[in-house]
Interface confidence: medium
């Protein structure tokens, strides 16, 4: 009775820094008792390791069992549907899950105003699951870059962009007043990882922030 159930149509990872989630699409016409078995293979150790026998969700957090991702050759995962004594064939992830698949994010962006400049400080992600020595800056130790988008409200211009090569940036506001909203998207120049825009942080700039010199 091994292959009566259809297999999950697709299986893939969606990952941020030390937040590694496996996703899959459900089988058609699944019943209330259908669940999914998840297994993991680490490159270099050519055997599948069962992670979950019966997950009723369509995703599984594999962070705890892939903590060495940033020092390994990567992983593959596979998922099959299970319903009582019946189970489907395995569906395997199409690509190797490696550090290249991790979407880069920032922790937060702190803004302050000083003498007509907006000063920004990018806080790097500090996930609780990360081992103490595995900081963002130790793993991505070179060529960190950030694209900065600034929106001015109100105003009939919105975005300015700039690539900065460190975690601090400044924007000369040239006498403009109003609310300035900032988003940051990280990248690493030597890598192909995608980056995600941070949530918008805003700060108000009024005339009181400008030093007048005669």
């Amino acid at each position: 009775h091994g292959t009566e159930l259809p297999s999950p149509p697709s299986v893939w990872f969606e990952a941020e820094f030390f937040h590694h989630i496996l996703h899959w699409t459900p089988i058609p016409n699944q019943s209330e008792s259908t669940c999914y078995e998840v297994a993991l293979l680490r490159y270099g150790i050519e055997s599948w390791n069962s992670i979950s026998n019966c997950s009723q969700t369509l995703s599984y957090d594999l962070t705890a069992v892939t903590l060495d991702l940033y020092h390994s050759n990567g992983y593959r995962a596979r998922v099959r549907a299970v319903d009582g004594s019946r189970h489907s064939n395995w569906t395997v992830t199409n690509t190797r899950f490696s550090v290249d698949e991790v979407t880069l994010t920032v922790g937060s962006v702190n803004l302050e105003i000083h003498n007509g400049f907006i000063l920004g400080k990018i806080q790097l992600p500090r996930p609780k699951m990360a081992p103490a020595n595995d900081t963002y800056e130790s793993i991505f130790s070179h060529f960190r870059e950030y694209e900065i988008a600034i929106r001015k409200v109100p105003g009939n211009f919105t975005f300015t962009h700039k690539k900065v090569k460190h975690e601090n940036f400044s924007l000369l506001t040239s006498g403009e007043v109003g609310e300035f909203c900032v988003q940051v998207k990280p990248s690493v120049a030597s890598r192909s990882n995608k980056g995600m825009w941070s949530k918008e942080e805003c700060i108000s700039l009024t005339r009181q922030y400008f030093t007048v010199t005669n």
């Epitope: 962009h161 700039k162 400044s170 924007l171 000369l172 506001t173 040239s174």
Partner: nanobody
Framework: QVQLQESGGGLVQAGDSLRLSCAAS????????VGWFRQAPGKEREFVAA????????YFGDSVKGRFTISRDSAKNTLYLEMNKLKPEDTAVYYC????????????????????WGQGTQVTVSS
């Protein structure tokens, strides 16, 4: 002294694309921020987009964000404005302008910051 000459304007239908060029003579654009402004009949001149010549920074106006792209070719000393999904309200004379300096500053959103201007090229978008 920098002389600027725009080209590429014309009459197009709504939804079409157009690419404007701005060639500089007299000296290189290096060390400048260069941009595009536009002026519709009976309206004030409006900021469209700008780019630092080193390519670090681009600035876009609200009304064109996501539709227009600004770029430059250092070898040809030429600035470009790629205009997609054009709307009738994009009808205007488009001016190329250059400002000395390329720090990251909102001064480049203001026409008073630009010392050098082209003669303009007419873009008409019919519905």
């Amino acid at each position: 002294q920098v002389q600027l000459q725009e080209s590429g304007g014309g009459l197009v239908q709504a939804g079409d694309s157009l690419r404007l060029s701005c060639a500089a003579s007299g000296r290189t654009f290096s060390g400048y921020t260069v941009g595009w402004f536009r002026q519709a009949p009976g309206k004030e001149r409006e900021f469209v987009a700008a780019i630092t010549w080193n390519g670090d920074t681009t600035y876009f106006g609200d009304s064109v964000k996501g539709r227009f792209t600004i770029s430059r070719d250092s070898a040809k000393n030429t600035l470009y404005l790629e205009m997609n999904k054009l709307k009738p309200e994009d009808t205007a004379v488009y001016y190329c302008a250059a400002a000395t300096g390329q720090e990251w500053s909102l001064q480049y959103l203001r026409e008073s910051s630009y010392a050098y201007w082209g003669q303009g090229t007419q873009v008409t978008v019919s519905s």
